[in-house]
Amino acid sequence: AQHVTTQLVLRNKGVYESVKYIQQENFWIGPSSIDLIHLGAKFSPCIRKDQQIEQLVLRERDLERDSGCCVQNDHSGCIQTQRKDCSETLATFVKWQDDTGPPMDKSDLGQKRTSGAVCHQDPRTCEEPASSGAHIWPDDITKWPICTEQAKSNRTGFLHMDCQIKGRPCCISTKGSCEITTREYCEFMHGYFHEEATLCSQVHCLDKVCGLLPFLNPEVPDQFYRLWLS
């Protein structure tokens, strides 16, 4: 059986939309599937790599690599999107390409970044972990770390940094899929909202879905002990 909830929820474009949340009800009247997984049920994607989920994550990453920061022209906010999802008239799509990106580092002025920009994250304004020396962030935003400390400045002068961020990674469903969404939408969908991250590639949704002990390698499920727990 399915339980359907409909509600007006604030979405990425800053407008309220009617959203449906469909929950698979437990046939035996008990915990939801998410809760059962958290309690240690035999759920194979938590035990070993699931090809379907792996493909989903790779597809999400490929899309994210090509994303940019969509900044609303009315200063109402910004969100990481694909160019096609960013209004040409009402917003500015900040995306580095060709020769428009910043240099990889102050020591290598010739090599430009082509992957980015990312809303609220920039190698030029992140103090921790700083992109310098032997630890220059790669020219692939899906390999960027979470910035734990921004440079202390109210304004940076960068469109994608000085905007009010409207969406962050949200882990939704037992498949461990990730979407950049508003907190409100994420909570309505019973997802896990990552306040600390800017990109889906920085979070490991399956690790969150599975719960219990974190995977040794967040990319590789290793909860073999589930076979005995349940």
Epitope: P102, P103, K106, R124, E127, A151, G157
Partner: antibody
Framework: QVTLKESGPGILQPSQTLSLTCSFS??????????VGWIRQPSGKGLEWLAH???????YYNSALKSRLTISKATSKNQVFLKIANVDTADTATYYC???????????????WGTGTTVTVSS | QVVLTQSPALMSASPGEKVTMTCSAG?????MYWYQQKPGSSPRVLIY???NLASGVPARFTGSGSGTSYSLTISRMEAEDAATYYC?????????FGAGTKLELK
């Protein structure tokens, strides 16, 4: 308000070492992304970049003069120093220090300049 | 090193006249920076990242260009614009400036 002020010996003889000080206020060189550079301008001529130093102590020099230049900083005193060894009459110029930042810029730029100090090398 | 050639070296314009000066790079650069220097004063930044107006700079100044060809335009010359203008690149070390364009008031 950001200000920079250069000071130097005014006059010195060939083969001596020129020591310049840039004292600044309104910003700190401990601030992430900040830098201070030195640029000189012989009278009636164009600008020549000499060197710059970053908040993280990385230093960059003009390769044509690198063997003679040394840049350093005293972060707590808000000062940057430039030494030019073995000066020659060709080093006679006005020396400027300038703040470097990348506020809103894909690269960096000299966004605030000092008033300059005139240095004459003469025997 | 990237050689920047500015032209003309000297020009004059009447108040209200449109002024355009160019900066040609010996090899391709991503962005150009423009500085204004009045006699007896230190330089000040006018344009950064080719076309962005620095804080406090009048809107009559515009920068444009790409690759090896860049220009600075003053839409309507004013007496206070009489100065020497320098272009500068931050694309590769050593950082280089053009020799300057001296703009005089007619």
């Amino acid at each position: 308000q950001v200000t920079l002020k250069e000071s130097g010996p005014g006059i010195l003889q060939p083969s001596q070492t020129l020591s310049l000080t840039c004292s600044f206020s309104g910003f700190s060189l401990s601030t992430f992304g900040m830098g201070v550079g030195w640029i000189r301008q012989p009278s009636g001529k164009g600008l020549e970049w000499l060197a710059h130093i970053w908040w993280d102590d990385e230093k960059y020099y003009n390769s044509a003069l690198k063997s003679r230049l040394t840049i350093s900083k005293a972060t707590s005193k808000n000062q940057v120093f430039l030494k030019i060894a073995n000066v020659d009459t060709a080093d006679t110029a006005t020396y400027y220090c300038a703040r470097i930042s990348n506020y809103g810029s894909n690269y960096w730029y000299f966004n605030v300049w000092g008033t300059g100090t005139t240095v004459t090398v003469s025997s | 090193q990237v050689v920047l050639t500015q032209s003309p070296a000297l020009m004059s314009a009447s108040p209200g006249e449109k002024v355009t000066m160019t900066c040609s790079a010996g090899s391709s650069v991503s962005y150009m920076y423009w500085y204004q220097q009045k006699p007896g004063s230190s330089p000040r930044v006018l344009i950064y990242d080719t076309s962005n107006l620095a804080s406090g700079v009048p809107a009559r100044f515009t920068g444009s260009g790409s690759g090896t060809s860049y220009s600075l335009t003053i839409s309507r010359m004013e007496a206070e614009d009489a100065a020497t203008y320098y272009c500068q690149q931050w694309n590769s070390y050593p950082l280089t400036f053009g020799a300057g364009t001296k703009l005089e008031l007619k």
